[in-house]
Amino acid sequence: MMTGTIETTGNISAEKGGSIILQCHLSSTTAQVTQVNWEQQDQLLAICNADLGWHISPSFKDRVAPGPGLGLTLQSLTVNDTGEYFCIYHTYPDGTYTGRIFLEVLESSVAEHGARFQIP
C-alpha cells in the first residue's frame, strides 16, 4: 500500500540564462528508495541510483548538475526549458511515486517563486 507523499517546489519561475534547483521530497513512508528519475515531459534528464549514484543523460550533461541531495540543478536556462518536470521515486515495497514541478523561464528580471504544494 502506498502511504507516502511527495512534496515538490511546485510552480516556479526563473530568469533566462540563470539556474534553478528542482527539489522533491518523499515522506510518510518507510519504503526503500532505489532510484529517482528526473524527467522533462517524456525525456529522461537524470537518474540518481541507490547503488551507482548519478547518471546524467548525455544530451543534458552541459546544463544539468546533480543535487543538492536528490534534487537537480538546471543551468543556462532558456525559454525552451519552460514546462513540466517530474521526479519519479522508485521505491520498494510501495512502488512508484511521481511529483510534478512546473517551471516558467522568464525573459524579464522578475522571477518569483511559487508556493510549495503537496502531491498525494
Epitope: 502506498m2 526503500q32 532505489t34 532510484q35 528519475n37 524527467e39 517524456d42 529522461l44 537518474i47 541510483n49 541507490a50 547503488d51 551507482l52 547518471h55 519519479i88 522508485h90 520498494y92 515495497p93 510501495d94 512502488g95 512508484t96 511521481t98
Partner: antibody, heavy 119, light 107 residues
C-alpha cells in the same frame, strides 16, 4: 548486441534445488537492474525476482520469498537464481531480463531455460 | 496485488488490418504500463513503455495509449511478422504483474 543466455534448467523432484545462470554480454552489465521472470505451462508470465545494479536491493514476490535467491557477479557478467524447496507450481520457463535505466520496463530478455518440478 | 486483465485472449485478423488489444488494471497505475511481444522460440521484445513510448527500433505501426486503469495497444497495417503473443505489464507497484496475453493470428 545485447545478449542474455540462460542455463541450468532441468528436471527436479519436489523439495529439490536448482541454480539458474544468465550470461550477459553486449552491454555494461554492472549498471543495469536485472530480473528473473517465468512463464508457466499455461503461458502466463510471472515476475520472480529483481536485483539492483550493485546487488544492494533485492525484491521477490511472496510466492518465492524465502525459497529463491537472486544474486549477481558483475565481474563475470552473470546473473543467478538459486531455487530451493521447489514445488510443482514452480514448473516454468525461466527468463532473465534487463531493465531500462529509467526502470520503466524490461528492454531485453533471454530465450529462457526450462524447469520441471515433478516426482 | 494489481490484477491486469487483458483482452481478447486471442485474435484473428487479416494482413493490413488495424487491431487493438486492451489491458485493464484493477487499480490506478498512472502511465506505468509496458507492452511486450513474444514470438515462437521465446523471443520476447519490449514494444511500448510508459503507456505510449515506442521502444528503440520498434516499427511506428505499433502505438500505445491510456493512463490510470485503461490501456490499449494498437497495431496498424498488420504485417506477417506481427504474428505473436502480446502481454501488458504494470510497473506501478510490487509485485510486478502481467496480463494474460493476447495471441494474434493471421486469417
Amino acid at each position: 548486441e545485447v545478449m542474455l543466455v540462460e542455463s541450468g534448467g532441468g528436471l527436479v523432484k519436489p523439495g529439490g534445488s536448482l541454480r539458474l545462470s544468465c550470461a550477459a554480454s553486449g552491454f555494461t552489465f554492472s549498471t543495469y537492474v536485472m530480473s528473473w521472470v517465468r512463464q508457466t505451462p499455461e503461458k502466463r508470465l510471472e515476475w520472480v525476482a529483481t536485483i539492483s545494479s550493485g546487488g544492494s536491493y533485492i525484491h521477490y514476490p511472496d510466492s518465492v520469498q524465502g525459497r529463491f535467491t537472486i544474486s549477481r557477479d558483475n565481474a563475470k557478467n552473470t546473473l543467478y537464481l538459486q531455487m530451493s524447496s521447489l514445488r510443482s507450481e514452480d514448473t516454468a520457463m525461466y527468463f532473465c531480463a534487463r531493465w531500462l535505466l529509467g526502470l520503466y520496463a524490461m528492454d531485453y530478455w533471454g530465450q529462457g531455460t526450462s524447469v520441471t518440478v515433478s516426482s | 496485488d494489481i490484477q491486469m486483465n487483458q483482452s481478447p485472449s486471442s485474435l484473428s485478423a487479416s494482413l493490413g488490418d488495424t487491431i487493438t488489444i486492451t489491458c485493464h488494471a484493477s487499480q490506478n497505475i498512472n502511465v506505468w504500463l509496458s507492452w511486450y511481444q513474444q514470438k515462437p522460440g521465446n523471443i520476447t521484445k519490449l514494444l511500448i513503455y510508459k503507456a505510449s513510448n515506442l521502444h528503440t527500433g520498434v516499427p511506428s505501426r505499433f502505438s500505445g495509449s491510456g493512463s490510470g486503469t485503461g490501456f490499449t495497444l494498437t497495431i496498424s497495417s498488420l504485417q506477417p511478422e506481427d504474428i505473436a503473443t502480446y502481454y501488458c505489464q504494470q510497473g506501478q507497484s510490487y509485485p510486478r504483474t502481467f496480463g494474460g496475453g493476447t495471441k494474434l493470428e493471421i486469417k
